[in-house]
Amino acid sequence: EVEKTACPSGKKAPEIDESLIFYKKWELEACVDAALLATQMDRVNAIPFTYEQLDVLKHKLDELYPQGYPESVIQHLGYLFLKMSPEDIRKWNVTSLETLKALLEVNKGHEMSPQVATLIDRFVKGRGQLDKDTLDTLTAFYPGYLCSLSPEELSSVPPSSIWAVRPQDLDTCDPRQLDVLYPKARLAFQNMNGSEYFVKIQSFLGGAPTEDLKALSQQNVSMDLATFMKLRTDAVLPLTVAEVQKLLGPHVEGLKAEERHRPVRDWILRQRQDDLDTLGLGLQGGIPNGYLVLDLSMQEALS
């Protein structure tokens, strides 16, 4: 807490300018009017204040706005944003995407800080849903943003926002997150033709059920191995050898290198060896010829 001291004669700041960098902390406190600071926040960024001086400026704004800063000030915080605590930010009501962009720009190139996470949370909650423009902005700054959300939070993403998602935005998503996102993507891209649809839906397929994979296998899509390896094991297991062959097209040749990894390993164990042999890759571990396969899950469902 800076002690309240009178401003020396002739030191009263008529405006926010470079002369203030020569002010001591107590002089800034005494000689800069908080209301003036609030109206001229856009100038602060252009002045090379020390961290200590920024602390004083923040303190003045805190006194002026104890219930939280107005958006007109927030939008021009610039580097002063880095001085804010999550508690400060929780008092804000940020509704403008421009304000969000301006503050994210300040933190650009760094990990998502607790301040940024709080800001985004406040912004999204204020909007009620994660709309396309917001998602576009957030994934541009933080490609991993989408995958940092819980399945519950993701459920508020409208299908229309899925158009903003790029493949790299889903790189760190786990199956539970893709389970939520896939149906939204399917809905968003439903009017596209076969090959265009596959290009868009491909990165969401980690959430696809068996019946959708079977349908894709009828469409000449040539799914690559990297995508196949990210599919849900339970969705892959019921696929026949013929369906996998059709689904992967020329990429089926890559199954051999992946035969010890999931979901390929588990899928091989469910196939007849005779059928696996038709792939021409020497895949081993299928059900020997002449063995009877009982589908116990079907039996349980009937009893």
Epitope: D224, L225, E253, G254, T278, L279
Partner: antibody, heavy 121, light 107 residues
């Protein structure tokens, strides 16, 4: 040891077709796909396509789809490539190659000696 | 398709010297690159796979490096039998593609 045997030369007239062979030995023929590669005089190597020897399903480089037809005869462990409507552009050395599936889609660890195809009237 | 741009197309070096050839892929190939030596009248000979893994029986004078889109191949302590054309091959995609080749001559 693994061997891929190809005839040394073929001389064919323009407009005709030719069927090049590649006889495999020293491994289980139906456990590895067979690939074909073209090399024109003074040029680099170009992948033509491959075939699953177990079910006879081929995949082609788009550039060769209307030129080459890949087939296999499992009983003799032989892969074939038929080239149709031959022109001087088809004069080249054609290699068959077997992949090793250690990682990804596999690199070629065994090659035939190549068949030199000459298209001339 | 993935394009492989190989350079230089030819080079000349002295016995005992060292040469380096590069291949640049049109997209990330995750180190799935192999290098071949090719002499007239023979099939290509595999030297290196997965960027830097030497094939059994290949002398350690041959080496490879790289990641992402950029890869290199070197031969040190050049010997007369190294005269050949060298090719890179990407196998990150089932539709394999080769580099244009580098013809190595000895000064």
């Amino acid at each position: 040891q693994v061997q891929l045997q190809q005839p040394g030369t073929e001389l064919v007239k323009p407009g005709a077709s030719v069927k090049l062979s590649c006889k495999a030995s020293g491994y289980t023929f139906t456990n590895y796909w067979m690939h074909w590669v073209k090399q024109r005089p003074g040029q680099g190597l170009e992948w033509i396509g491959n075939i699953n020897p177990s079910n006879g399903g081929p995949y082609y480089n788009e550039r060769f789809r209307s030129k080459a037809t890949l087939t296999v005869d499992k009983s003799s462990s032989t892969a074939y490539m038929q080239l149709s409507s031959l022109t001087s552009e088809d004069s080249a050395v054609y290699y068959c190659a077997r992949p090793y599936y250690g990682s990804s889609y596999g690199y070629f660890d065994y090659w035939g000696q190549g068949t030199t195809l000459t298209v001339s009237s | 398709d993935i394009q492989m741009t190989q350079s230089p197309s030819s080079l000349s070096a002295s016995l005992g010297g060292k040469v380096t050839i590069t291949c640049k892929a049109s997209q990330d190939i995750n180190k799935y690159i192999a290098w071949y030596q090719h002499k007239p009248g023979k099939g290509p000979r595999l030297l290196i796979h997965y960027t830097s893994e030497l094939q059994p029986g290949i002398p350690s004078r041959f080496s490879g490096n790289g990641s992402g889109r950029d890869y290199s191949f070197s031969i040190s302590n050049l010997e007369p039998e190294d005269i050949a054309t060298y090719y890179c091959l990407q196998y990150a995609n089932p539709l394999r593609t080769f580099g244009g080749g580098t013809k190595l001559e000895i000064k």
